[in-house]
């Protein structure tokens, strides 16, 4: 009897990530003794819902509760019936929403209402759904990682849970992307902040960290490209729009009232003289660099540094951890290797952009090809961002790991969530007493 | 909780401008639109136009276009609502409202009065 | 533009008693499904404040006393209850379109 293991109290969660392209479901599972341990919850399943974003449904909210169907029984068939009641349930909404919001709150209201409506219908517990803010968003990121990443554990290892885990306690930065914006947080060398609305607090497991964060509403990769064709066809001289970001050869046809359509392109709102323009890859990384360069204001700075548009940002301070669509993205293009300098990844940008479209849509003929003719510009956006919108350098780069999950759960700001709102996340470092989580008797 | 604390009463001659001012706490300013909205003594209310803080995009009612410009300074959390060309009809209480739709939050009001 | 008609202009009711306020809007104020209707109090040095949103819905600190209905084109405003403190001006505004419109306001004053 003495190797006899117990059965396992285990405890489950489901997060939703109501994203502005689209919704993934995660169910989370930990062991009910140990919910105050670090790094003891752990992924167990992603479901990606079909179709878009939630704030794309505000034209069709009866279609709600179809589109949520597939994932919420899986999550039914994945956790076992006896624990279903006791399981949370809760859906995060995040930039999409925000933008839905800005434009209307009845309509964002009406979203939530019916999403709220169609989440209670199932048999967990469900908690509520909710647009979370910038700042969460960016905060919960952090938690995710670190948390992950073992950083929060004050146990120091002998071994290395992750190829890029580092045996100190500093904590990694979080960045994150996603189609509407993107996320920078990290604890600056200088405690003191200059800019209050970026600064937070938090003492989790006996240690206080100062964290910076921000988000930057309209600059995650969908968003960042509606402001850039909207930025660019006011100075067209025709319904044809040359443009470097995208594979030579490539047309598409863009209806002028979709591109504004979104608050993010309010300032290059003008009236033309045609509905719709026809865009025109020429496929020229340099020149797509220059254009995306255009989004960032970097002339106005009321603080003694910036990011851009005016936002403070402090020196940037010790290893990022790159996540969502930095992870994507890059992954796409084979570019994640630690081995992979700067310089080099500004080079096979160069080569993929300049590749025909009909070539480009051969060698990747299993990916659709919405997807597939934006990685151009996204490719050439996330090395714009990190570089001269985040101030990293070729010298920097190295510190920039590009993570798509940690011990098998996604990096995101999903964990971090679930892990407050169920108080698994204590200020205090846990006394844990000799053989008080033995599982053998 | 939110706030929009707007600038002082003001004293024009025609054919002058104004500059009202409009600072908001409580909440990230770039994440709702502001409204200028404004009511002549005894009138009904009349909207002006909005700015999109997050970037300074806006709209204006075509009454004033051309007259009013609404911009916006994010490091202070305010926007501002400049009327030109005054004339005496355009004395009013001026109001910051926030929202996208629903002017649930609003400014005390700046009483502008123009008056040779 | 669309026109908002607010109907009567003024009108006295008993402390205790109902009172009903109408508003016409030139053409329909819903869109996707949500009125764009809104009712606002104002009292006399004060800005206006919000009661009700989306036709309906009663903003947050608001008493139960005062309701909205209606849709498309035609809405009502109902203090079920008057009390002395409801003495104001109401006015009605949509936002489907720019530019946002307001009513004429309706005065309410004690019988």
């Known amino acids: 009897t003495q190797n006899k293991a117990l059965p396992e109290n285990i405890k489950y969660g489901i997060v939703l990530d109501a994203g502005s392209s689209h919704t993934s479901l995660y169910i989370y599972k930990w062991p009910a003794e140990k919910e105050n341990d670090t790094g003891v919850v752990h992924q167990v399943e992603e479901c990606r819902v079909k179709g878009p974003g939630i704030s794309k449904y505000v034209q069709k909210v009866n279609e709600i509760g179809i589109y949520l169907t597939d994932c919420m029984e899986r999550a039914r068939e994945v956790i076992p019936r006896s624990q279903h009641q006791e399981t949370p349930v809760y859906l995060g909404a995040t930039a999409g929403m925000r933008l839905l919001r800005m434009e209307s709150e009845e309509l964002a209201d009406r979203v939530l209402d019916v999403v709220e409506r169609s989440l209670s219908n199932y048999p967990f517990d469900f908690q509520g759904a909710r647009i979370i803010t910038g700042q969460e968003e960016g905060a919960y990121g952090w938690i995710t990682i670190n948390y992950l990443l073992g950083k929060f554990s004050q146990k120091t290892r002998w071994f290395s849970i992750v190829p890029y885990e580092t045996n100190n306690q500093e904590t990694f930065g979080a960045l994150d992307l996603g189609g509407a914006s993107t996320q920078i947080t990290f604890v600056p060398q200088n405690q003191t902040t200059e800019s209050p609305d970026n600064a937070l607090q938090f003492r989790l497991y006996g240690k206080d960290y100062n964290v910076y964060t921000h988000s930057f509403l309209c600059y995650g990769k969908d968003q960042a490209l509606w402001q850039k064709l909207a930025k660019d066809i006011q100075v067209a001289s025709n319904e044809i729009l040359r443009d470097p970001c995208f594979h030579p050869g490539y047309k598409k046809v863009v209806n002028v009232s979709d591109l504004y359509k979104t608050p993010c392109t309010k300032r290059f709102e003008m009236t033309l003289p045609f509905q719709q323009f026809e865009i025109q890859g020429i496929g020229n990384y340099q020149q797509c660099h220059q254009s995306v360069l255009e989004l960032f204001n970097t002339s106005y700075c009321p603080y003694s540094q910036c990011a851009f548009n005016g936002i403070f940002l402090p020196p940037l301070q010790g290893d990022f951890g790159a996540f969502s669509a930095f992870y994507f993205v890059m992954n796409f293009l084979n570019l994640t290797s630690e081995k992979v300098s700067q310089e080099k990844v500004t080079e096979m940008m160069k080569k993929f952009c300049s590749q025909p479209w009909e070539e480009i849509k051969t060698s990747y003929a299993g990916v659709k090809e919405k997807y597939l003719s934006e990685y151009c510009f996204s490719g050439t956006y996330i090395l714009s961002l990190l570089l001269q919108g985040y101030h990293f350098t070729a010298d920097s780069w190295e510190h920039i790991h590009f993570i798509g999950k940690i011990q098998g759960s996604d990096a995101g700001w999903t964990l971090g969530y679930m892990l407050n709102l169920t108080n698994m996340i204590p200020a205090e470092q846990p006394l844990s007493t000799p053989l008080s989580h033995s599982t053998y008797v | 909780q939110v706030q929009l604390v707007q600038s002082g009463a003001e004293v024009k001659k025609p054919g002058a401008s104004v500059k009202v001012s409009c600072k908001a706490s409580?909440?990230?300013?770039?994440?709702?639109?502001m409204h200028w909205v404004r009511q002549a003594p005894g009138q009904r209310l009349e909207w002006m136009g909005y700015?999109?803080?997050?970037?300074?995009?806006?709209t204006f009612n075509q009454k004033f276009k051309g007259r009013v410009t609404i911009t916006r300074d994010t490091s202070a959390s305010t926007a501002y609502m400049e009327l030109s060309s005054l004339r005496s009809e355009d004395t009013a209480v001026y109001y910051c409202?926030?929202?996208?739709?629903?002017?649930?939050?609003w400014g005390q009001g700046t009483l502008v009065t123009v008056s040779s | 533009d669309i026109v908002m008609t607010q109907s009567p202009d003024s009108l006295a009711v008993s402390l205790g008693e109902r009172a009903t306020i109408n508003c016409r809007a030139s053409e329909s104020v819903d869109n996707f499904g949500v009125s764009f209707m809104y009712w606002f109090q104002q009292k006399p040095g004060q800005p206006p404040k919000l009661l009700i949103y989306?036709?309906?819905n009663q903003g947050s600190g608001v008493p139960d006393r005062f309701s909205g209905s209606g849709s498309g084109t035609d809405f009502t405003l109902t203090i079920s209850s008057l009390q002395a403190e409801d003495v104001a001006v109401y006015y009605c505004?949509?936002?489907?379109?720019?530019?946002?419109?307001f009513g004429g306001g309706t005065k309410v004053e004690i019988k």
């Open positions: 700015i999109v803080p997050l970037n300074g995009g806006s």
């Open positions: 409580g909440y990230t300013f770039t994440d709702y639109n």
């Open positions: 989306g036709a309906s």
């Open positions: 409202a926030r929202g996208g739709t629903r002017f649930a939050y």
């Open positions: 505004q949509q936002t489907k379109e720019v530019p946002y419109t």
